[in-house]
Amino acid sequence: MMTGTIETTGNISAEKGGSIILQCHLSSTTAQVTQVNWEQQDQLLAICNADLGWHISPSFKDRVAPGPGLGLTLQSLTVNDTGEYFCIYHTYPDGTYTGRIFLEVLESSVAEHGARFQIP
């Protein structure tokens, strides 16, 4: 039975040209996290394997940095980066947990961080 929950940074906004940290946290389970994947819509941005480390997709290596922790840093943001991002936790024995973050990249300097929320 999957008892865990993923807490994410939720709906967030950031300025064009700036950077943003995408963060997820898995709680309420004793399952072993074996790998975390970060995805944007249908594209795999990065893999963080618990034993074998971080691997950034060649398509994103210039604008994506690992961490902090299991999070992901997006740099040199453009308006095209607006959209849904997913953290996918592969765990044993529970299986897969998925968290969703919506990022809006703004032209102006009024970007504010959204509230944190939970996805069961």
Partner: antibody, heavy 119, light 107 residues
Framework: EVQLVESGGGLVQPGGSLRLSCAAS????????MSWVRQAPGKGLELVAT????????YYPDSVKGRFTISRDNSKNTLYLQMNSLRAEDTAVYYC????????????WGQGTLVTVSS | DIQMTQSPSSLSASVGDRVTITCKAS??????VSWYQQKPGKAPKLLIY???TRHTGVPSRFSGSGSGTDYTLTISSLQPEDFATYYC?????????FGGGTKVEIK
């Protein structure tokens, strides 16, 4: 030059134990996660264990979980695989392997050591 | 676990032929795929990672492509040293699993 040299294979009876070693050189061993991959005679490849750089995290597929233990001694630049309760289906060549720097694939492999489980 | 199904399991080809090997994943693995070459009695050699990136020193006749569940390794002009067995591997989820292999033999 990266070098991985396995040893410790041999013939063992079903239910027996064996410990494999992999001596690493040519890179900073303590900075890399490591893996063991096996290949049964005439068959494909199977990843059987992984360990992080400091030995604090390990992973095993269900096929060997509870029977195999991966460990490392960073002071000796050596990776180990302790295999207990061995079965005939564990007969294989066992390779230690390391991912390439910045490559999502096993770029470095040892020559392999053969483990035969038979009565 | 994700199953990686390679086809064909073996093929016969001549030097200079264009050879295509396919690997089908049991679920979307989003380009987290690598390819290896193995010769008898030797360890595998990494050819391609992230579905299409050639590893250092790999000849340009080897190329990889694909997305979703379907991936391809192509040898544009088969050379005598290319007769070997080829394996795909997925890294999308643990355990990282391999395909069953494709043996490329001399016609």
């Amino acid at each position: 030059e990266v070098q991985l040299v396995e040893s410790g294979g041999g013939l063992v009876q079903p239910g027996g134990s064996l410990r494999l070693s992999c001596a690493a050189s040519g890179f900073t061993f303590s900075s890399y996660g490591m893996s063991w991959v096996r290949q049964a005679p005439g068959k494909g490849l199977e990843l059987v264990a992984t360990i992080n750089s400091n030995g604090g995290s390990t992973y095993y597929p269900d096929s060997v979980k509870g029977r195999f233990t991966i460990s490392r001694d960073n002071s000796k630049n050596t990776l180990y695989l302790q295999m207990n309760s061995l079965r005939a289906e564990d007969t294989a060549v066992y390779y230690c392997a390391r991912l390439g720097t910045g490559t999502l694939g096993f770029a470095y492999w040892g020559q392999g050591t053969l483990v035969t489980v038979s009565s | 676990d994700i199953q990686m199904t390679q086809s064909p399991s073996s093929l016969s080809a001549s030097v200079g032929d264009r050879v295509t090997i396919t690997c089908k994943a049991s679920q979307d693995v989003k380009t987290a795929v690598s390819w290896y070459q193995q010769k008898p009695g030797k360890a595998p050699k990494l050819l391609i990672y992230w579905a299409s990136t050639r590893h250092t020193g790999v000849p340009s006749r080897f190329s990889g492509s694909g997305s979703g569940t379907d991936y391809t390794l192509t040898i544009s002009s088969l050379q005598p040293e290319d007769f070997a067995t080829y394996y795909c591997q997925q890294h999308y989820s643990t355990p990282w699993t391999f395909g069953g292999g494709t043996k490329v033999e001399i016609k």
